[in-house]
């Protein structure tokens, strides 16, 4: 007897973290003996999507022509062969931003700030918010992500670096979200521009410390796994 | 049109167990998850069970948990509602109601067969 | 278990708006819980309204809405006609089994 079917890949165009009202279509790419593509989110109560596939057979296309809280969320897709259903694709986790209005990033003490020395990014959202997200332009992973704890909402997050290296110069945005959902954030932040001065090259930040910059897919946020207390809020990187 | 016809109901004694079928017509059966949902005498409407389209995911209200199982036949466009270590508070009218090709086409509960009414008494 | 709460009565005129609500126990009702909502005519004929992903079922009249209003699931009759008085429900998804409210009984005073 044969082996389970192959598990077919999912993947969302032109990203998997879209604006509110913008279109996103998500891909299911299983073999040529496809004949249905089932699209499934995570905790709902029926199948998401089911279509045929496109020609020739080993693809099928679910289009969100205008993106809305609904359609945030992990999704897993299969396919059904003459054989039977396919194991499931790794999960896609698709974000909305937009669902609230933005917060604002600042620098302490100064955006500009001498290599060897620290500094802190303030996110802040007008209301009390208990996930906060952090987010470098053109990092591999760019983000930090700090939650409260025991779901206690705050209005601001601190983001301290230290000591400041030539890796933490760059453009960085942040998000606030409520924890309900992980798939729904703000409107981001306006940018603010880190500016790192001085020749004083220090080693490497280490995750704990500062903006991730493991490798990884640009489009793909960070989900929370590991955790550390830090000023009432629990910090979380990958 | 779409027709939903419940029977199998009847008297039965506690801790006994019963099947309940319902026929569907008017519709493309295998595409569609089904619901069984129940009234009881004078209460309201509480939904007992649903399966997916081919099957492959079952949910069940708690309080049947472990002694009804909802399964389907889609080449007899049939559904079925086992009951087994039936209780007096299982006695309602037993509905089946049809549910969604997807969620992102149609309505779940779109629409309902007439009932049958199942009553658990010594 | 949660449990699902809304108005036991409602009385309203003809073209009149009237909004049904139906919170949950568990806290806010969200998109997540996919709202929905089921008439009861006399005779124990339930139809299907609105639900899934603010989807109506094919022929019921647009005058029928859906909606979330602050921490709440609504039904909106934007107005009303005699022919719609009767019971509804309306039910929410946790996780993995749905919960039904105990029915509006909404009067259409003619």
């Known amino acids: 007897q044969a082996g389970p079917l192959p598990k077919p890949t999912l993947w969302a165009e032109p990203g998997s973290v879209i604006s509110w009202g913008n279109s996103v279509t998500i891909w299911c790419q299983g073999t040529l003996e496809a004949r249905e593509y089932r699209l499934d989110k995570e905790e709902s109560p029926a199948p998401w999507d089911r279509q045929n596939p496109l020609e020739p057979k080993n693809k099928a296309r679910f289009s969100i022509p205008s993106m809305t809280e609904d359609y945030a969320g992990r999704y897993r897709c299969y396919y059904r062969s003459p054989v039977g259903w396919s194991q499931p694709s790794d999960p896609l986790e698709l974000v909305m931003t937009g669902a609230y209005s933005k917060p604002t990033l600042s620098a302490l003490p100064s955006p500009l700030v001498t290599s060897g020395k620290s500094v802190t990014l303030l996110c802040q959202s007008r209301s009390p918010m208990d996930t906060f997200l952090l987010i470098k332009e053109r990092a591999a992973h760019p983000l930090l992500h700090l939650r409260s704890e025991h779901g206690a909402q705050q209005h601001q997050a601190e983001f301290p670096m230290s000591p400041v290296t030539s890796v933490h110069g760059g453009t960085y945005r942040c998000f606030s979200s409520h924890g309900f959902s992980h798939y729904l954030l703000s409107h981001p932040s306006d940018p603010l521009e880190l500016i790192v001065s001085g020749s004083l090259e220090g080693p490497r930040p280490s995750p704990t410390r500062s903006v991730s910059t493991a490798a990884g897919p640009e489009d793909q946020p960070l989900m929370p796994t590991g955790s550390v207390p830090h000023s009432g809020l629990r910090r979380h990187w990958e | 049109q779409v027709q939903l016809v419940e029977s199998g109901g009847g008297v039965v004694q506690p801790g006994r167990s019963l099947r309940l079928s319902c026929a569907a017509s008017g519709f493309t059966f295998s595409t569609y998850g089904i619901h069984w949902v129940r009234q009881a005498p004078g209460k309201g409407l509480e939904w007992v069970a649903v399966i997916w389209f081919d099957g492959s995911n079952k949910y069940y209200a708690d309080s049947v948990k472990g002694r009804f199982t909802i399964s389907r036949d889609n080449s007899k466009n049939t559904l079925y509602l086992q009951m087994n270590s039936l209780r007096a508070e299982d006695t309602a009218v037993y509905y089946c109601?049809?549910?969604?090709?997807?969620?992102?086409?149609?309505?779940?509960?779109?629409?309902w067969g007439q009932g049958t009414l199942v009553t658990v008494s010594s | 278990d949660a449990v699902v709460t809304q108005e036991s009565a409602l009385t309203t005129s003809p073209g009149e708006t009237v909004t049904l609500t139906c919170r949950s126990s568990?806290?806010?009702?969200?998109?997540?819980?996919?709202a929905n909502w089921v008439q009861e005519k006399p005779d124990h004929l339930f139809t299907g309204l609105i639900g899934?992903?603010?989807n109506r079922v094919p022929g019921v009249p647009a005058r029928f809405s859906g909606s979330l209003i602050g921490d709440k699931a609504a039904l909106t009759i934007t107005g009303a006609q005699t022919e719609d008085e009767a019971i509804y429900f309306c039910?929410?998804?946790?996780?993995?089994?749905?919960?039904f409210g105990g029915g509006t009984k909404v009067t259409v005073l003619g």
């Open positions: 039910a929410l998804w946790y996780s993995n089994h749905w919960v």
């Open positions: 109601a049809r549910d969604v090709i997807s969620m992102v086409r149609g309505v779940p509960f779109d629409y």
């Open positions: 899934g992903i603010n």
């Open positions: 568990t806290g806010a009702v969200t998109t997540s819980n996919y």
